[in-house]
Amino acid sequence: EKSDLRTVAPASSLNVRFDSRTMNLSWDCQENTTFSKCFLTDKKNRVVEPRLSNNECSCTFREICLHEGVTFEVHVNTSQRGFQQKLLYPNSGREGTAAQNFSCFIYNADLMNCTWARGPTAPRDVQYFLYIRNSKRRREIRCPYYIQDSGTHVGCHLDNLSGLTSRNYFLVNGTSREIGIQFFDSLLDTKKIERFNPPSNVTVRCNTTHCLVRWKQPRTYQKLSYLDFQYQLDVHRKNTQPGTENLLINVSGDLENRYNFPSSEPRAKHSVKIRAADVRILNWSSWSEAIEFGSDDG
C-alpha cells in the first residue's frame, strides 16, 4: 500500500522534515542522486537557498524568521527520476495570540532586557517563554529571569551574555490551556541593540590659553577598539541666556581620547559632558556627568 502511495504522490517518498530547533531541513537520501537543492519561500515570496550539507540529504538555514509562515521545498534528481516535495511550515495557533512589540537592548556592557506585549487575541491564561540561539554554536539559552505583568511573562532579563554571538535568533513561544498560541521570532544584531554607557574618567585641565579634555572609552559588550567609537562633546558656558546654543563637537575615537580647545584666562565657568556611539550606527549613549571648569568671575 505504501508503495502505491509513493507512485500516486511521488513527493511523499522524500519524507521531508524540518527541525526548528536546529533550522535543519532533511529528507530521505535517494540512491544515485545526481542533483539536489532545498529552499524556502516566505510570505513575501522571498526565496532563501542555503548550501547543502555534505551528505546532500539535509540543509541548514542560518538566518531566517519563521513566524509569518514559510514553505520549504526540496528537489532531488536521481539517475532514474526526479522528486519534488513541499513542506508547509505555518505558524499554527489563533491569529493575534503571538507576543508583539518585541525588542531587546544590551546595557552596562553585560546585561540585556527583552520586552514584549501580550497578543491582542491571547487568552487570559497565556504564558510566553523566550529562547535565544546564537549563530555560531547553535546553543539555546532559556530566559533565566522573567519580567511579569499579572502573572504573564512580558519580558526577560539576562545577566550573562556569554552565550550570545554577533547575531542571534530570538523565539517567543506561547502556551494556553484554551487555544493554540502562535510564536514570534526575530534575528537581532548585538551591535544594533547595544546602548553604550557614557565615556568614563572625564577630566579637564586648563593652562593660560587652552583646555584639554580627556576621557576613556566606555566598556561595551561588543568587542570594539578605539577607532570604532565616535564621541560628541557638549562644551557649555554656564549662566548664559536661555536659548543660547551649546557648542557640540564631534571627535573620532583615538588611542588617547582627548580634545584640546583654545580658552584663555580669565575664563568664565563652563561645563563639559561627553557621549559615545558606535561610529557605524551613531546610536548615542546618554551624556556623562557634567564637569565644571573656569570661575564665576571669569
Epitope: 568587542k223 570594539l224 577598539s225 578605539y226 577607532l227 570604532d228 588611542l255 561610529v279 557605524r280
Partner: antibody
Framework: QVQLVQSGAEVKKPGASVKVSCKIS????????IHWVRQTPTKGFEWMGG????????VYAQRFQGRVTMTEDTSIDTAYLTLSSLRSDDTAVYYC?????????????WGKGTMVTVSS | QAVLTQPSSVSGAPGQRVTISCTGS?????????VSWYQQLPGTAPKLLIY???KRPSGVPDRFSASKSGTSASLAITGLQADDEADYYC???????????FGGGTKLTVL
Amino acid sequence: QVQLVQSGAEVKKPGASVKVSCKISGHSLSELSIHWVRQTPTKGFEWMGGFDPEENEIVYAQRFQGRVTMTEDTSIDTAYLTLSSLRSDDTAVYYCSIVGSFSGWAFDYWGKGTMVTVSS
Amino acid sequence: QAVLTQPSSVSGAPGQRVTISCTGSGSNIGAPYDVSWYQQLPGTAPKLLIYHNNKRPSGVPDRFSASKSGTSASLAITGLQADDEADYYCQSYDSEPTEIRFGGGTKLTVL
C-alpha cells in the same frame, strides 16, 4: 604618543627559529590588540596572527599554524613573535601593529619592521 | 595570488584625481566585511588611510576618500601631490578561511 619599537634585523639558517620583539610605549599593552604582519617582495603582505578579543586568545593564520607562536609580557609592554623551522621564503620584513578597529580589522599603528633573512 | 585584486600601477599628473580599485569576493568584501586602505612610502611601514570602508583617521587629509559596493572597493585621491607617490594596499577580513587579507598593492606614480 604611542610607539612600537621592534628588535633589530636577524640573519638565520634554514631550520632555525627567530624571535622578534615589539615594545609598546605610550600605552598599556594589556589594553591593546597586537597583530603581526609580514611583507615579502613576492607575496606582499601576509597576516600572521594576533589577539582576537572575541575569542579572548591569540589566533593564527592557517598557513603559519604549528610554526608560529605569539606571546605577550604585559609587565614590560612587549609582544613577541617566534617563527620556527625557517625556510628561505620566510625572508621578509616582520611588522607588529595595533588593531584600531575590529570591524574588518584596521591596523592603525605600526612598528618600523624587523628584517629577517633566512640563508644558508 | 592575492585574494583581493588591485591594479599593479596607476598614474596621474599633479592636481589630478586617481582611483584605485580592489576586487574581492562574497567571503570578504561582499560578506560584508569592512575595507581598510594603507599607504606605504618607500622604505617605511604602512600608514592607515581609511577604515570602516570610508572613514579617515585624524591627520589623513580629505583628499583621500573611499567607497565600497558589493564585492569591490575603491580609493580615490584628488588634488594629486608629488608626495602621494607610494604603494597603496586594500585590506579586509575573509571568512574562508578566517583570515585577514591584503591586496597585492598598487604603485601610484605622480607624473
